[in-house]
Interface confidence: low
């Protein structure tokens, strides 16, 4: 049967990192310089990504697979395939059209990238504000205020307002 | 090469598919990005489509366009066509890096005219 | 958004003659600039990208320069074929998800 299928296509003897040259008698040719083919019995061979300017090389192009980037420092990957790259911002801030802002009254990020998210509302879970907030951090919940011991206290939060200078995002 | 198709006379509110079709290259490692100029005026950059599918959009030509890609084609299709949408529509081959893209392969463009 | 503004609209040099185009940015663009050639009739041609890499075949006559808000192209010994109009183009962050990119409004070059 491989006989069979390489009299009616000689293209599929081509192995991964050449092409099927239609030029040269369906000759197997190696890819060029800059390109690759992951399989075999390609009649083309793909041209690599290149990763430039904000983008930096994380695995190099080689002639049976693509290369891969990430992003440079203070930068970070959006997209399958690292196919963006958006800029960090500090804890306790989020990216927003006008550049990197803190997080609103009542919001936190913990991390580099993403949004702030609201703290969470304790008492809900009936449960009271252990440690407050910050634009970094949490709350931390502790036990049912009905819970506490003799002599602990919770930490009454303070009311949901904005602080000054921090515009809803 | 890159060669744009689609472009015709319509009237506004018909909506319009305006194709690019690639060859010599992967749209799994390029970026395509589409560019209009209204006649005798400059060039307006619409949006650009990545190698992943994700797209961003000129903040006026949002919903107003969409885009989408196989293989070998990109669509740019205007949604509801106003008069203000009479241009050359260009697509071109541009650098897969969403900070620094430039367009280094471009088509002769299609021509789009809206009018009642 | 961010918005370009390039001056001169026109300008007319005699060839063999030096030929400058401004493109200024509202915001810091950090050299994500690219200059484009269009003559009449045709597509737009890229000339410089990252503000002074020159793209592959176009002749070191046509220089670019600049950084933060302030980019020039340069076009010396000016050629008859150099008549044309030239646009500077960026990279804008649009918001959160997007990014995007935005045109000058264009400089057309008269050769005499």
């Known amino acids: 049967f491989e006989r069979t299928r390489s009299l009616q296509d000689p293209c599929s003897n081509c192995p991964a990192g050449t092409f099927c040259d239609n030029n040269r008698n369906q000759i197997c040719s190696p890819c060029p310089p800059n390109s690759f083919s992951s399989a075999g019995g390609q009649r083309t061979c793909d041209i690599c990504r290149q990763c430039k300017g904000v983008f930096r090389t994380r695995k190099e192009c080689s002639s049976t697979s693509n290369a891969e980037c990430d992003c440079t420092p203070g930068f970070h990957c959006l997209g399958a395939g690292c196919s963006m790259c958006e800029q960090d911002c500090k804890q306790g801030q989020e990216l927003t059209k006008k550049g990197c802002k803190d997080c609103c009254f009542g919001t936190f990020n913990d991390q580099k990238r993403g949004i702030c998210r609201p703290w969470t509302n304790c008492s809900l879970d009936g449960k009271s504000v252990l440690v407050n907030g910050t634009k970094e951090r949490d709350v931390v919940c502790g036990p049912s205020p009905a819970d506490l011991s003799p002599g602990a206290s919770s930490v009454t939060p303070p009311a949901p307002a904005r602080e000054p200078g921090h515009s809803p995002q | 090469s890159v060669e744009e198709s689609g472009g015709r006379l319509v009237t506004p509110g018909t909506p319009l598919t305006l194709t690019c079709t690639v060859s010599?290259?992967?749209?799994?490692?390029?970026?395509v990005t589409w560019v209009r100029q209204p006649p005798g005026k400059g060039l307006e950059w619409i949006g650009v489509?990545?190698?992943?599918?994700a797209t961003a959009f000129a903040t006026w030509a949002k919903g107003r366009f969409t885009m989408s890609k196989n293989s070998t084609t990109v669509a740019l299709k205007v949604t509801s066509p106003t008069t203000e949408d009479t241009a050359t529509y260009f697509c071109?081959?541009?650098?897969?890096?969403?900070?620094?893209?430039?367009?280094?392969?471009w088509g002769q463009g299609t021509l789009v005219t809206v009018s009642s | 958004d961010i918005v370009m503004t390039q001056t001169p609209s026109s300008v007319s040099a005699a060839v063999g003659g030096t030929v400058t185009i401004n493109c200024q940015a509202s915001e810091d663009i950090s050299s994500y600039l690219s200059w484009y050639q269009q003559k009449l009739g045709q597509p737009p041609k890229l000339l410089i990208y990252?503000?002074?890499t020159l793209e592959s075949g176009v002749p070191s006559r046509f220089k670019g320069s600049g950084s933060g808000t302030e980019y020039t192209l340069t076009i010396s010994d000016l050629e008859s074929d150099d008549a044309a109009t030239y646009y500077c183009?960026?990279?804008?962050?649009?918001?959160?998800?997007?990014?995007?990119?935005?045109f000058g409004g264009g400089t057309g070059v008269v050769v005499k």
């Open positions: 489509i990545y190698d992943n599918g």
């Open positions: 010599g290259f992967s749209l799994t490692y390029y970026a």
């Open positions: 183009q960026s990279y804008y962050s649009g918001s959160i998800s997007g990014y995007g990119f935005v």
């Open positions: 990252k503000a002074s």
């Open positions: 071109a081959r541009s650098a897969n890096n969403a900070w620094s893209t430039y367009s280094n392969l």
